[in-house]
Interface confidence: medium
């Protein structure tokens, strides 16, 4: 069957996100992928969206992330804009209202996004073949 247009949009957004580092991509987030063996695909997407929402809600106006220069400021604003887009698309793909995120493990946002990109690319290769 054909790939969901949302999936393509997610991969595109993840590509943009992982291309550039900002002051806060080294901050840690809950690593939902560490123990996701008994988790459905929809739950994984929902939990990923929850983690991203927690991150941008907490750090959108974090002055450490906004930096001191115009370039740092705009890079961070762009990061937040992409995270919000990703969050919205993941919720659409998940089709769930809410999901618990209780893991103790942490990973950097950068690594979290790379892992999510790998998962999404695998899903895309399956649905496009």
């Amino acid at each position: 069957h054909k790939c969901d247009i949302t999936l393509q949009e997610i991969i595109k957004t993840l590509n943009s996100l992982t291309e550039q580092k900002t002051l806060c991509t080294e901050l840690t987030v809950t690593d939902i992928f560490a123990a996701s063996k008994n988790t459905t695909e929809k739950e994984t997407f929902c939990r990923a969206a929850t983690v991203l929402r927690q991150f941008y809600s907490h750090h959108e106006k974090d002055t450490r992330c906004l930096g001191a220069t115009a370039q740092q400021f705009h890079r961070h604003k762009q990061l937040i804009r992409f995270l919000k887009r990703l969050d919205r698309n993941l919720w659409g793909l998940a089709g769930l209202n809410s999901c618990p995120v209780k893991e103790a493990n942490q990973s950097t946002l950068e690594n979290f996004l790379e892992r999510l990109k790998t998962i999404m690319r695998e899903k895309y290769s399956k649905c496009s073949s």
Partner: nanobody, 116 residues
Framework: EVQLLESGGGLVQPGGSLRLSCAAS????????MAWVRQAPGKGLEWVSW????????YYADFVKGRFTISRDNSKNTLYLQMNSLRAEDTAVYYC?????????WGQGTLVTVSS
């Protein structure tokens, strides 16, 4: 031609207030985020505050949070910076900047000197 004209700077005592204005022309003001940026003597440029095109989204650098307020009047094509509780370290040339992806147009600046 894009023009940004700052005014309102001057000499003020520590603890005092100033209100900077920036009159914009040559572009559709309401379509752009705008920023105040400053350069202290012998230092590099640092952003002070940013406001979204509708005025509902604002950001402040740590060193001015709670003291400075950015605002805009799209009907007058004017950007403002209300500066309260001024300190000696706020002494700088303040520039307003048109902002879309980067601060791509600057005014000539207005000098703010905080001294007793």
């Amino acid at each position: 031609e894009v023009q940004l004209l700052e005014s309102g700077g001057g000499l003020v005592q520590p603890g005092g207030s100033l209100r900077l204005s920036c009159a914009a022309s040559g572009f559709t003001f309401r379509n752009y985020g705008m920023a105040w940026v400053r350069q202290a003597p012998g230092k590099g440029l640092e952003w002070v505050s940013w406001i979204g095109q509708y005025g509902d989204e604002t950001y402040y650098a740590d060193f001015v949070k709670g003291r400075f307020t950015i605002s805009r009047d799209n009907s007058k094509n004017t950007l403002y910076l209300q500066m309260n509780s001024l300190r000696a370290e706020d002494t700088a040339v303040y520039y307003c900047a048109k902002s879309l992806g980067r601060f791509d147009y600057w005014g000539q600046g207005t000098l703010v000197t905080v001294s007793s």
